[in-house]
């Protein structure tokens, strides 16, 4: 394991930290290098350094090493914050315990077991000896510190300052005795960095010799510091990947603390009637799986042998045969008493909060095979076999029937927004399930965002309605009224459907809303001939996080010279940068004598990366957002415009490419607006229009 070792594992890392020497006599050495690993190797071997290297700083910006003969505990030194620096301190010099015989111990204990002060190694008084620092290079025979240069049985020792006692061992504890954990060590944040067989642990931020998913930046709450033993995944006790290429991982020997209590911060919220999160804190007495099969006792090995015993999983309350989640599974589960069914989830236990999905999916969830069977609004899913006719109506291939079992949430139509199910409720034929994408899953659902692959326009003809070119007509613009006042804009995309923003509906009482169509003046003055006033019959909320709503009108709008629909873009399309677009709204204009007339502001499309730069890097845009900058300083959407459209033209066809939503501020000079990207949600819109029933005119 020592052959061509990667010595960075022997260092404790403190990110964004450097050491400043207050004492000018302290030496340092610097050199340009590529990686922190190179600094570590040189520090460990003391190669070409005029001192014993105890720590180094890697300057990431300048790609430079600064080697030190001191560390953060030395006098004449202070720690300082610095974005570009990472401090690495040799653990041997800061450890206050020993591993094995303590051959590598380089701490500062200088008193023997019986309390006698140690004699300095460079002195021959009171005892003459041959253990000279010059003869034992690398063994750090400094000052009068306890050492074990030959790796002898008793551990670190020293010659004593008492002429009567030549030498004596020092009372330095084993690291395995100092380190202790509670329960199964999920909250352990100690400094044990080797396994129970003595193998050195691999750093969590390294992928060699073993590739793994536990990246510190992906799991900031798991304590993945340096190469210390941890228990991120509900194992019986802490473990680590090892530096031995033939041993992927091994448990660490960390004893249970005498006072086996958990910190409040480590305890999952205990519930007895329902599941919070993934149900790790569920302590109720449900003892059957979802279909009624009784659970096997946790302390029994019949009919299924297992290691999920109360002894292995202390603090997980593995009492009797109650459903529990000791290992961070999707939800509480148990071994079953049926010899043919090893385990089953207790999915009949309700969620304390439906919004916390107890499950996750990858990509768009088309391979999701979990057993959640409830929509995000709490409706029970209906059986797939009862809905096959409806499913065939909106997909053009044969769905995989083997996946469509029972009434579980699935994604048979390749929906971009995750698993869903039919509900059996005629008003809400189907809805998404409260399942999120798995943490760290970055599979894009649309690729090549900034490269125009798919055209947004469906056709290349100029569409004309009643002899009036739609490009001069804004009949698709809707004024959403709340308690008789204009509150938001919206776009008529079909006779019965208006696309708008989720935030435009403060009340749940649909009687509080109306849609005005065919108007130019926000108060409807002079628009009496052309105005259509329609009630709202339903709100269909967009996929989680979309901020979109499809508002169903109580009766279809009548399309005429003043009221028209606007086209949707193709799903996943990209509109070229610098395309000229417009936003429309009756919102706040910044004028004191606001005349209430529909306003337009001209914007141009900007790529997501460029847009992020304009926002000084404070916003990262994703595939569900589109950005447009103002041609005129300070023109753009504001309060009262929310829900309204960003309209662009391609091949002489006008489309709604964006929806104005709160959260990105009113039009600030040099700050482009960020809109919900309709193309990303186009399939969802079509699916709703196709599957939700609307009143006939």
């Amino acid at each position: 394991q020592r052959k061509r070792r990667n010595t960075i594992h022997e260092f404790k890392k403190s990110a964004k930290t450097t050491l400043i020497k207050i004492d000018p006599a302290l030496k340092i050495k610097t050199k340009k290098v590529n990686t922190a690993d190179q600094c570590a190797n040189r520090c460990t071997r003391n190669k070409g350094l005029p001192f014993t290297c105890k720590a180094f700083v890697f300057d990431k910006a300048r790609k430079q090493c600064l080697w030190f003969p001191f560390n953060s505990m030395s006098s004449g030194v202070k720690k300082e914050f610095g974005h570009e620096f990472d401090l690495y301190e040799n653990k041997d010099y800061i450890r206050n315990c020993i591993i094995g015989k303590g051959r590598s111990y380089k701490g500062t204990v200088s008193i023997t077991k019986s309390g006698i002060k140690c004699q300095p190694w460079s002195s021959m008084i009171p005892h003459e000896h041959s253990f000279l620092p010059s003869s034992y290079r690398g063994k750090d025979l400094q000052e009068n510190y306890c050492r074990n240069p030959r790796g002898e049985e008793g551990g670190p020792w020293c010659f004593t300052s008492n002429p009567e006692v030549r030498y004596e061992v020092c009372d330095i504890p084993q690291c395995s005795e100092v380190e202790c954990m509670t329960c199964n060590g999920e909250s352990y944040r100690g400094l044990m960095d080797h396994t129970e067989s003595g193998k050195i642990c691999q750093r969590w931020d390294h992928q060699t010799p073993h590739r793994h998913k536990f990246l510190p930046e992906r799991y900031p709450d798991k304590g993945f510091d340096d190469n210390y033993c941890r228990n991120p995944d509900g194992q019986p006790r802490p473990w680590c990947y090892t530096l031995d290429p033939h041993t992927r991982w091994e448990y660490c020997a960390i004893k249970t603390c005498a006072d086996n209590t958990m910190n409040d911060t480590d305890v999952p919220l205990e519930t007895t009637e329902c599941i919070q999160g993934q149900g790790e804190g569920y302590r109720g007495t449900v003892n059957t799986i979802w279909n009624g099969i009784p659970c096997q006792r946790w302390d029994s090995q019949y009919p299924h042998e297992h290691d999920m015993t109360p002894e292995n999983f202390k603090c997980k309350d593995l009492r009797e045969n109650y459903c529990r989640n000791p290992d961070g599974s999707e939800s509480p589960w148990c071994f079953t008493t049926d010899p043919n069914i090893r385990v089953g989830y207790c999915s009949q236990i309700p969620n304390c909060d439906m919004s916390h999905g107890q499950d996750c999916y990858r990509g768009n969830g088309k391979n999701y095979m979990g057993n959640l069977s409830q929509t995000r609004s709490g409706l029970t899913c209906s059986m797939w076999d009862k809905n096959m006719e409806d499913l065939h109506r909106h997909i053009f291939w044969e769905p995989d029937a083997s996946k469509l079992n029972e009434n579980y949430c699935r994604n048979p139509d390749d929906d971009a927004h995750g698993p869903w199910c039919y509900t059996g409720n005629p008003l809400i034929p189907w809805d998404y399930c409260p399942i999120s994408r798995c943490e760290g899953d970055t599979t894009p659902t649309i690729v090549n965002l900034d490269h125009p692959v798919i055209s947004c326009a469906k056709t290349k003809q100029l569409r004309v309605v009643n002899g009036i070119p739609t490009r001069t007509n804004i009949g698709w613009m809707v004024s959403l009224r709340y308690r008789n006042k204009h509150i938001c804009g919206g776009s008529l995309i079909k006779e019965s459907w208006v696309l708008t923003a989720r935030q435009c509906f403060p009340s749940r009482d649909l009687k509080d809303y109306e849609a005005w169509l065919g108007i130019h003046d926000v108060h409807g003055r002079g628009d009496e001939k052309c105005k259509q006033v329609l009630n709202v019959s339903q709100l269909v909320y967009g996929p989680e996080g979309s901020d979109l709503v499809l508002m169903k009108l109580a009766r279809p709008a009548v399309l005429d010279d003043f009221v028209s629909t606007i086209d949707l873009p193709n799903y996943g399309c990209t509109i070229p940068e610098k395309t000229s677009c417009s936003v429309y709204g009756w919102g706040y204009t910044g004028l004191i004598n606001y005349d209430g007339l529909l306003r337009v502001a001209h914007l141009y499309i900007m790529g997501n990366e460029k847009c992020s730069q304009h926002h000084r890097g404070k916003v990262t845009l994703n595939e569900s957002e589109i950005c447009a900058g103002a041609e005129k300083i300070g023109s753009g959407p504001c309060e009262g415009d929310y829900g309204g459209p960003l309209v662009c033209e391609q091949h002489k066809m006008r489309m709604v490419l964006g929806v104005i939503v709160p959260g990105r501020g009113c039009a600030i000079p040099n700050r482009p607006g960020i809109f919900v990207r309709v193309a990303y949600y186009a399939k969802w819109i079509h699916k709703i229009i196709l599957t939700y029933k609307v009143p006939q005119s």
Epitope: R483, Q503, C504, P506, R508, D509, D512, E639, G640, G663
Partner: antibody, heavy 115, light 110 residues
Framework: SVEESGGRLVMPGTPLTLTCTVS????????ISWVRQAPEKGLEWIGV?????VTDYASWAQGRFTISKTSTTVDLKIPSPTTEDTATYFC?????????????WGPGTLVTVSS | AYDMTQTPASVEVAVGGTVTIKCQAS??????LAWYQQKPGQPPKLLIY???KLASGVPSRFSGSGSGTQFTLTISGVECADAATYYC????????????FGGGTEVVVK
């Protein structure tokens, strides 16, 4: 967190503005409500300002109070306080952007209207 | 209007006992109801939302039920720390509302 300020002793008819300062969340994600409690009395809802800037008031509070906001503060203006307006005034974060339950409350600020 | 009526105004209960507080809406509010606990000198604290969902960190001895116009808050295995005033609040609509809160129920623990 949310925290109220501006509560003090005022004469009847002297305009008063209370401010709710928010941190750790954005007013573009959550609505904010004002609630008051007269000494030894129950909670009385005054009004709410939604994410989109629209306001709603209790029927008795309409015209007596005005709620407005900036990016990090929400103001409650009492243009002409009366002795009946003596109370502790709370601002509360509404769960979500519209009307809903209140999942975060400030400690309150005391307004005393007296001549 | 969606106004709320809470009963009783006050209730006395022994440690370990169970207390039930009722809240009635003037018209249906589906499940859009929340319950709060308030102790003297403190702001209210959310206990239950959407009629039956337990807020984060709230002990499971608190439970809520009901929908439409009739709602109940139950505290079982009452502890001394539960002595407080409890309020319901409708989270449905504020059109022409006088008060979104119920009048409150004082719980005295013996």
């Amino acid at each position: 967190s949310v925290e109220e300020s501006g509560g003090r002793l005022v004469m009847p008819g002297t305009p008063l503005t209370l401010t709710c300062t928010v941190s750790g969340f954005s007013l573009s994600s959550n609505a904010i409500s004002w609630v008051r409690q007269a000494p030894e009395k129950g909670l009385e809802w005054i009004g709410v300002i939604y994410v989109i800037g629209v306001t709603d008031y209790a029927s008795w509070a309409q015209g007596r109070f005005t709620i407005s906001k900036t990016s990090t503060t929400v103001d409650l203006k009492i243009p002409s306080p009366t002795t009946e307006d003596t109370a502790t005034y709370f601002c509360a974060r509404v769960y979500d952007s519209g009307w809903n339950h209140f999942n975060l409350w400030g400690p309150g600020t005391l307004v005393t209207v007296s001549s | 209007a969606y106004d709320m009526t809470q009963t009783p105004a006050s209730v006395e209960v022994a440690v370990g006992g169970t207390v039930t507080i009722k809240c009635q809406a003037s018209q249906s509010i589906s499940s859009w109801l929340a319950w709060y606990q308030q102790k003297p000198g403190q702001p209210p604290k959310l206990l239950i939302y959407e009629a039956s969902k337990l807020a984060s960190g709230v002990p499971s001895r608190f439970s809520g039920s009901g929908s439409g116009t009739q709602f109940t808050l139950t505290i079982s295995g009452v502890e001394c720390a539960d002595a407080a005033t409890y309020y319901c609040q409708q989270a449905y609509s504020v059109a022409n509302v006088d008060n979104a809160f119920g009048g409150g129920t004082e719980v005295v623990v013996k």
